[in-house]
């Protein structure tokens, strides 16, 4: 190389990553094999689970607002699951990205698209649930499948918009040991007059924005929606059972558990620009927490359906029945009563979820919880006598 040849500019943290060399340590090789196996299994599970959810909810079920939310969540998770095999291949060939720069950009973008879409959709689901309880009349008049699809399209557009910087700044970087990284290179486009300043500001901007938009804000919306619903029900003199409250907390915990560690390490990575001492911690931890975030897409279908104790029996009967029992819409549980009665019954059902879900085959655990989040009481479309009685009773 000539003395004046300018090398590809890299941020210090990225250049240091490119200097890390692979070990031929046997125990590390075993860990790698286990990781490949685990990610391969997760890929398969994620694709099958989300594919089944999409097929059943999209083609075999009556379309409601709730099924619309689930359809879009499953689509997001299917996209993420579809990108997992390529990540598995990256691991299998010794942590080297052999699929080119364009595919590196696309693959990474799918991860971030799923991150934003999941956060946004969960927020929408929570707000939808909140509106049903806090503004029942408005909800009854405006909650349509078409409106839900429009909201989802807007949310997808926002998710795509937020993903653009991650597409733009993703790059393939050759490591000194011959491997190829698929990682952020924030100096890729218009590095500015001072690379240090650009590296610092862009890394912090990316980390903080994704933490806020894809994690903190959705979590705040979910929490405040739940609080608003709880308060409204308390004012009406309804007593909510502790078990149900714990279930609601479980869905929030599932989201926080899968994405929380990723955002923590992402923020640490941004901080590591100015504090090199943090870099080894980030290098060791980030692959694990990224995988955990990926596995959220595999876990989500389980949260919708597969945690019923008598799941196998229900699966044998009909997957459609199972899904409908979990995803049936509050507003469509009402009997032949007037719209006034249905609006009232929606609130009544929200107030007493256990009474509504007192059938012997009621879903438990996260399925019940997601039912609440999605505005359902896990009651099947063929409502029992108690449900019919409640739905035709005005307050």
């Amino acid at each position: 190389m000539s003395a004046n040849a300018t090398l590809k500019p890299l941020c210090p943290i990225l250049e240091q990553m490119s200097r890390l060399q692979s070990h031929s340590n046997t125990s590390i090789r075993y860990i790698d094999h286990a990781a490949v196996l685990l990610h391969g299994l997760a890929s398969l599970l994620g694709l099958v689970e989300n594919g089944v959810i999409l097929f059943v909810v999209g083609c075999r079920m009556r379309q409601t607002v709730v099924t619309t939310w689930v359809l879009h969540l499953a689509l997001s998770d299917l996209l993420a699951s579809a990108s997992l095999p390529f990540f598995t291949y990256f691991l299998a060939v010794g942590h080297s990205w052999e699929l080119g720069t364009t595919f590196c950009k696309l693959h990474s973008s799918i991860f971030f698209l799923n991150m934003f879409a999941s956060g946004f959709l969960l927020s929408a689901i929570s707000l939808d649930r909140c509106l049903q309880v806090v503004r029942p009349v408005w909800a009854q008049n405006h909650r349509t499948v078409a409106a839900a699809h429009k909201v989802c399209l807007v949310l997808w557009a926002l998710a795509v918009l937020n993903t653009v910087p991650y597409f733009v700044f993703r790059d393939t970087i050759s490591r000194l040991d011959g491997r190829i990284m698929c990682y952020y290179n924030v100096l890729l486009l218009n590095p500015g007059p001072d690379r240090d300043a650009t590296c610092n500001s862009r890394q912090v901007a990316l980390a903080v924005s994704k933490f806020l938009l894809a994690f903190l804000v959705p979590l705040a919306i979910i929490a405040s929606s739940h609080a608003a619903v709880s308060l409204r029900l308390q004012h009406r003199g309804r007593r909510r059972p502790g078990r149900f409250v714990r279930l609601v907390a479980a869905v929030v915990a599932a989201f926080a558990l899968c994405w929380g560690p990723y955002h923590v390490f992402s923020l640490l990575e941004a901080r590591a620009h100015a504090n090199p001492g943090l870099r080894p911690l980030v290098w060791r931890g980030l692959p694990f927490v990224t995988s955990l975030a990926f596995f959220n897409s595999v876990a989500n279908p389980v949260l919708y359906v597969l945690t019923c104790p008598d799941m196998l029996r229900k699966l044998r009967r009909s997957l459609r029945t199972v899904l409908e029992s979990v995803l049936v819409d509050d507003s469509e549980l009402g009997g032949a009563g007037s719209s006034r009665r249905r609006r009232t019954s929606s609130t009544a059902r929200s107030a007493s979820p256990l009474a509504l879900c007192s059938r012997p085959e009621e879903p438990r655990g996260p399925a019940r919880l997601l039912g609440w989040l999605l505005g359902s009481c896990a009651a099947s479309p063929q409502t029992g006598p108690l449900n019919r009685a409640l739905s035709s009773t005005s307050s």
């Epitope: 003395a3 500019p9 210090p12 250049e15 240091q16 200097r19 001072d194 300043a197 001492g277 870099r279």
Partner: antibody
């Protein structure tokens, strides 16, 4: 051809000040981070200061922090080292060096001698 | 601060000899190490960067290796122009410190 030429060295009394310059040529100066490294007579090398390519970030070891200031003028392709409150132990040959990327000094000047003595 | 300890401080060798200089850091420096060659009255010259990478124009008889805290500069067959003082320097966390140097002399 890459060239780094230091100037401004000389004899100075303890507590005095001195400003070193390093004229760069043969490469795009504004693309590279730069450093100053010194070598006391008969001793080893000691890194003294570093500045990012645009001048927004500077780093110093504890031995000179607060006394030395590194700066650059990209329009003049020149690197500077302002040395205040000089001590006898600051006596050394001062080299300016170009960073290959973020680190690794790939080109060095021939050095300028700074003598701090009363 | 990270301390860099070079050994030996000096060595005598003949042309054609294989020479090994070691550098130990007081903590893991993750391959962020450079080796320089300095001849009397001259400026240092970069020989190896990132612990293992040969700088432009450096003969292939020079090689760098190591990881963690221990690094090595090897000259496979010493040539007359290789007699000089060699310094290691880490670039992990500032301050970037140098080793005290290893003087390679003619036997």
């Amino acid at each position: 051809e890459v060239q780094l030429v230091e100037s401004g060295g000389g004899l100075v009394q303890p507590g005095g000040s001195l400003r070193l310059s390093c004229a760069a040529s043969g490469f795009t100066f504004s693309f590279y981070s730069m450093s100053w490294v010194r070598q006391a007579p008969g001793k080893g090398l000691e890194w003294v200061a570093r500045i990012s390519n645009g001048g927004s970030t500077t780093d110093y070891p504890g031995t000179v922090e607060g006394r030395f200031t590194i700066s650059r003028d990209n329009s003049k392709n020149t690197l500077y080292l302002q040395m205040n409150s000089l001590r006898a132990e600051d006596t050394a040959v001062y080299y300016c060096a170009r960073h290959r990327t973020n680190w690794d000094f790939d080109y060095w000047g021939q050095g300028t001698l700074v003598t701090v003595s009363s | 601060d990270i301390q860099m300890t070079q050994s030996p401080s000096s060595l005598s060798a003949s042309v054609g000899d294989r020479v090994t200089i070691t550098c130990r850091a007081s903590e893991n420096i993750y391959w962020n190490l450079a080796w320089y060659q300095q001849k009397p009255g001259k400026a240092p010259k970069l020989v190896v960067y990132a612990a293992t990478q040969l700088a432009d124009g450096v003969p292939s008889r020079f090689s760098g290796s190591g990881s963690g805290t221990d690094y090595t500069l090897t000259i496979s067959s010493l040539q007359p122009e290789d007699f000089a003082t060699y310094y290691c320097q880490h670039f992990w966390i500032t301050p970037w410190t140098f080793g005290q140097g290893t003087k390679v002399e003619i036997k």
